[in-house]
């Protein structure tokens, strides 16, 4: 984790002047002037009664205010005197001192008061040197550290027993500790004290860094006893038009000319092709004049632009039909969605005087009229002799977002003599067990001289067809079955070939022994 | 391209009833008729009947009368043959066909315990 | 009902030859109006049928021309002029004229 701060509550290293601390009896410990390692004046406590046993020698801190502080910590420096190497003392010599610490809402202390013992006083621990000096060495410095908790008044006492130990107190220093602030994960946590236990873990909540989003929650870090953080919980990431900088402790705008699209980790990116940025923090890069972006398409794509128009388009015409064909725009506008649109205009008048208008509804495009995908349609049921123009028109994903109407290149044909129209219906005149006799009106657009009409038919259950051509507009079939259905269609020819059949017609014959229905007198000739 | 597209094989308990389907497709449905035809292994073909799709007027083979029910939805230009009181002497491949030319797949049905 | 009766077997046939496959009507199929109601079908393996052969002597559409069909009212000859190894299933031959229509219990094809 982070490293731990330390707090100071007291520390003699920097106090000049007399402590002046209450010592009990004043027989026992004694302040004096000494120098630290670095020769700095210090002042010092020290008790030194080993010739005389039953030692009991306390000595008291001043009153320290605990600032909202629940573990405090005790950094005691001191030498204790080897008690072998002093002659002629006593069995009751000790290497050891006593801690303890009371704790009070002001400075209530005094000369008799608490009474100097265990309870009220609390014993934080026995300290004994890691090592003594004997006479002939220089004083060896100990230092031990120790702590207590929890604490809750408004602050404390230290107080220090000698049982009969030959040493020198050199500094006291009491502190807490406390996480410092700190970034992770793109989020801020604040500075925070540990808890009352050196196992305790204090909950820090978080809150992202400027330009950083939540992607979990909720944010915490832990401060342990030792004032270092751990087991982040939740994080942030830069928010959309921002990317992470010194070492995820800062999300910084992405500069002008680059964007990022999504939150996260990831840097910020150059604007895709066609398009800028003019502005810091940008989430996505606009599009050049005369550049688009589809609805579909994401914020990391190109932009792109619409296809030029189609190129060689070629008419073939059949009659009232035609083909058109034609080849890939020469530029797709930087897209892979083209499709062809094919826009029908018939013209009246003659030559540059013409006025072309849309092409009527009845007008049949295969495979159809718009969003074509392959280079080809098949256009029928035109006028016959009649003039148009037609347009294929290239679009593509964008073409929808331009002002201007799709690019397109124009063809102008002129139909020619058509096939007739389909024979209206037909209708029976007669029937007997083996025939049927049928008469039709003439198509409705005949487009030319009508040569003959050639009838086909079958019979339901069979399903098998024949056919008979005939000269007039009816005919009589023969050969057929009794009590049997029949489907009959009927097409006229011209010299421009066969029009289309008419819809089926159902006709039954009747049985073998009923007699024939009433002939018609009236047979049309062509 | 003249299709028809028969429903999948049929496994019933005897006694039961099966309703077997033909989808017909490329043509007009209502100027052919649809007949049915069954297959028994080591027995040959037998007609069952012929229905007119347009009106539904059926003509039945004497010996599937009250056996087979044939209908038609003009809608899905589908046809349908009931075959009920089912027994073992059913289980067969049964087609149908438009007018006498296309057939369909056939459909196997198998009458067990 | 019109009973249609057929061979179970053909004559064993080498490929390349013709072949003859009979069928024989209890009743006349010549209608008043001069149409036989004759048909032949194949059934290859595994497979539905298939219309050869319709009104005794006219040719299926998609059908090879190497299939004929010929006969009188109540007796029948289909005839395969060079047989192929395609060729191979049951014949069957059919009575379109009066209900019921009946089948004939079907020829298979042999080849040596």
């Known amino acids: 984790g982070c490293r731990a701060l330390e707090e100071t509550l007291m520390d003699t290293k920097w106090v000049t002047s007399e402590l002046a601390w209450t010592s009990h009896p004043e027989s026992g410990w004694e302040e004096v002037s000494g120098y630290d390692e670095a020769m700095n004046p210090i002042r010092t406590y020290q008790v030194c009664n080993v010739r005389e046993s039953s030692q009991n020698n306390w000595l008291r801190t001043g009153f320290i205010w605990r600032r909202d502080v629940q573990r405090v910590y005790v950094e005691l420096k001191f030498t204790v005197r080897d008690c072998n190497s002093i002659p002629n003392i006593p069995g009751s010599c000790k290497e050891t001192f006593n801690l303890f610490y009371y704790e009070a809402d002001s400075d209530v202390a005094s000369a008799s008061s608490p009474f100097w013992m265990e309870n009220p006083y609390v014993k934080v621990d026995t300290i004994a040197p890691d090592e003594s000096f004997s006479r002939l060495d220089a004083g060896r410095v100990n230092t031990k550290v120790r702590s207590f908790g929890p604490l809750s008044k408004a602050g404390f006492y230290l107080a220090f027993q000698d049982q009969g130990a030959c040493m020198s107190l050199i500094s006291v220093r009491a502190f807490y500790k406390k996480c410092a602030s700190t970034t992770a994960g793109f989020a801020l946590f604040p500075e925070t004290l540990t808890g009352a236990e050196p196992t305790s873990l204090v909950i820090a909540p978080g809150t992202c860094i400027p330009n950083a989003v939540e992607v979990s929650v909720p944010l915490k870090l832990y401060c342990n006893g030792d004032g270092e953080w751990m087991v982040p919980v939740g994080a942030c990431t830069c928010a959309t038009g921002h990317e992470p900088a010194a070492k995820e402790s800062q999300c910084r705008p992405c500069p002008p000319g680059s964007y990022k699209a999504k939150q996260g980790e990831g840097p910020c990116l150059p604007c895709p092709p066609n398009s800028r940025t003019t502005s810091p923090a940008a989430s996505i890069c606009t599009c050049h004049n005369n550049f688009y972006r589809a609805d579909s398409d994401s914020a990391d794509s190109a932009c792109t632009t619409v296809p030029s128009p189609p190129r060689g388009v070629i008419s073939n015409v059949n009659e009232t039909s035609l083909i058109l064909e034609w080849s890939e725009p020469r530029d797709l506008g930087g897209r892979d969605d083209l499709l062809y649109n094919v826009i029908c205009k018939k013209c009246h008048g003659a030559g540059g005087a013409s006025a072309c208008s849309r092409c009527d509804d009845n007008v049949e495009f295969v495979p159809r009229q718009l969003g074509l995908t392959e280079r080809r349609v098949h256009i029928s049921h035109l006028l016959a002799h009649t003039r148009y123009t037609f347009e294929v028109q290239a679009v593509n994903g964008v073409s929808g977002k331009s002002p201007l109407p799709p690019r397109y290149a124009a063809v102008n044909i002129t139909t020619n003599q058509a096939a007739p129209s389909e024979v209206p219906t037909l209708r029976l005149h007669s029937s007997s067990g083996s025939s049927l006799t049928l008469s039709w009106a003439p198509p409705e657009r005949p487009n030319g001289v009508i040569l003959d009409y050639e009838m086909k038919y079958f019979e339901k259950s069979e399903g098998i067809a024949s056919t008979v051509t005939s000269q007039m507009n009816s005919v009589q079939l023969d050969g057929l079955r009794p009590d049997a259905r029949y489907v009959v269609q009927v097409r006229a020819r011209t010299v421009a070939g066969y029009g289309q059949y008419s819809r089926p017609a159902e006709f039954e014959t009747t049985s073998e022994r009923g007699s024939g229905a009433q002939q018609l007198q009236e047979q049309l000739p062509l | 391209e003249v299709q028809l597209q028969q429903s999948g094989a049929e496994l019933v308990m005897p006694g039961a009833s099966v309703k077997l389907s033909c989808k017909a497709s490329g043509y007009t449905f209502t100027s052919y008729y649809i007949h049915w035809v069954k297959q028994r292994p080591g027995q040959g073909l037998e007609w069952i009947g012929e229905?007119?799709?347009?009106?539904?007027?059926?003509n039945y083979n004497q010996k599937f009368k009250g056996k087979a029910t044939l209908t038609v939805d003009k809608s899905s230009s589908t046809a349908y043959m009931q075959l009920s009181s089912l027994t073992s002497e059913d289980s067969a491949v049964y087609y149908c066909?438009?007018?006498?030319?296309?057939w369909g797949q056939g459909t196997t049905l198998t009458v067990s315990s | 009902d019109i009973v249609m009766t057929q061979a179970a077997f053909s004559n064993p046939v080498t490929l390349g030859t013709s072949a003859s496959i009979s069928c024989r009507s209890s009743?006349?199929?010549?209608?008043?109006?001069?149409?036989?109601?004759l048909y032949w079908y194949l059934q290859k393996p595994g497979q539905s049928l298939q219309l050869l052969i319709y009104?005794?002597?006219n040719l299926a559409s998609g059908v090879p021309d190497r299939f004929s069909g010929s006969g009188s009212g109540t007796a029948f000859t289909l005839r395969i002029s060079r047989v192929e190894a395609e060729d191979v299933g049951v014949y069957y031959c059919m009575q379109h004229l009066e209900y019921p229509f009946t089948f004939g219990g079907g020829t298979k094809l042999e080849i040596k």
């Open positions: 009104r005794m002597s």
């Open positions: 229905i007119d799709p347009s009106d539904s007027y059926t």
């Open positions: 009743k006349s199929l010549l209608h008043s109006n001069g149409i036989t109601y």
């Open positions: 066909t438009r007018g006498i030319t296309n």
